[in-house]
């Protein structure tokens, strides 16, 4: 478990940090193990990065953040919302929220409470 | 049948104590947050405090936060506030509740409330 | 003065629908899970919707709730004089580690 900085962290500091940060090897990492490593997904070429250095990208990058329940349901909110899109079906949807929910254990960091993934307005 | 039955509150002089006991039955209190929630005469509702499931965290107002302390005896099913220092502005029914928060991701909600214990702080 | 706003009060005719808002900011409603109350005069209050959208058991279906971003909605349709009541929303804020509860919205059915 990382050190904390901070209670819970400022919204707008969090905002600021997700920005700042590069998501797309989480949710490529996401992708790849809801499409259990088919070749399905080429919006991104993930065919030449393992599974699991996508995942020690993901965690580097949420890594440069802080370690505070705030700032990663802002980051978890993030993917579902960049992600939401591509998710074909509802099957789809509730896959890529199990998976993203599992994210912060994986990283060995704080999982986020009360963390609202439905984010999208409806559009997932 | 959930029931909560707070007892407990009354007239206290400002700056005086008061403690608040909560009665639960008809569910697994120690599978449950628990919460306090009051409500001044003609007054919106104001949360107080947070209670973990098994009592290791708690959450509290900020104008409450070192005053009032939040307990609970799964043993007994029961929940307690301790109430110091007590001001003028603490005057109000303060209700027990049952949270439905449960993980990460699901909220705070307040499926079952008791009858509410008035306390009044006056001179 | 609520962080949570909604409206002080709202009055609609019976069979009417009526909605009452709930605007926060991104670190309670943006964030997280909103739940809705109804306050009968002189009785505890009772909860309609909670983790936005879902209705506890034998709540009716004419209520329902809704979010999108910073702000939440209860919808009643089919409204009866029964629903005249005191109404309020409520959420976590991750920034000051508390529930929030709105000033609350008091319904009169004309």
């Known amino acids: 478990m990382r050190r904390e900085r901070g209670r819970q962290g400022d919204s707008s500091s969090c905002e600021r940090q997700v920005d700042r940060v590069n998501l797309k090897p989480c949710e490529q990492h996401i992708m790849q193990r809801i499409m259990g490593e088919q070749e399905q997904y080429d919006s991104y070429d993930i065919r030449s990065t393992r599974s699991s250095d996508q995942q020690q990208r993901c965690c580097d990058e949420l890594n440069e953040m802080e370690n505070t329940q705030r700032c990663m349901c802002e980051a978890l909110q993030q993917i579902m919302e960049n992600q939401c899109d591509r998710l074909q079906d509802r099957q789809m949807v509730q896959q890529f929220k199990r998976e993203l929910m599992n994210l912060p254990q994986q990283c060995n960091f704080r999982a986020p409470q009360r963390c609202d993934l439905d984010v999208s307005g409806g559009r997932c | 049948e959930v029931q909560l039955v707070e007892s407990g509150g009354g007239l206290v002089q400002p700056g005086g104590s008061l403690r608040l006991s909560c009665a639960a039955s008809?569910?697994?209190?120690?599978?449950?947050?628990m919460t306090w929630i009051r409500q001044a005469p003609g007054k919106g509702l104001e949360w107080v405090a947070n209670i973990k499931q098994d009592g290791s965290e708690k959450d509290y107002l900020d104008s409450v936060r070192g005053r009032f302390t939040i307990s609970r005896d799964n043993a007994k099913s029961s929940l307690y506030l301790q109430m110091n220092s007590l001001r003028a502005e603490d005057t109000a029914v303060y209700y027990c509740?049952?949270?439905?928060?449960?993980?990460?991701?699901?909220?705070?909600?307040?499926?079952?409330w008791g009858q509410g214990t008035l306390v009044t702080v006056s001179s | 003065q609520s962080v949570l706003t909604q409206p002080p009060s709202i009055s609609a005719a019976p069979g009417q629908k009526v909605t009452i808002s709930c605007s926060g900011t991104?670190?309670?409603?943006?964030?997280?899970?909103v739940s809705w109350y109804q306050q009968l005069p002189r009785t505890a209050p009772r909860l309609l919707i909670f983790?936005?959208?879902k209705r506890p058991s034998g709540i009716p279906d004419r209520f329902s709730g809704s979010k999108s971003g910073s702000s939440a909605t209860l919808g009643i349709t089919g409204l009866q004089t029964g629903d005249e009541a005191h109404y309020f929303c409520?959420?976590?804020?991750?920034?000051?580690?508390?529930?929030?509860f709105g000033g609350g919205t008091k319904l009169t059915v004309l």
């Open positions: 991104g670190s309670n409603i943006g964030h997280n899970y």
């Open positions: 008809g569910f697994k209190f120690s599978t449950f947050y």
């Open positions: 409520a959420t976590w804020d991750a920034d000051l580690s508390a529930v929030l």
């Open positions: 983790d936005n959208t």
């Open positions: 509740t049952r949270n439905g928060l449960q993980d990460s991701y699901s909220g705070d909600f307040f499926d079952h």
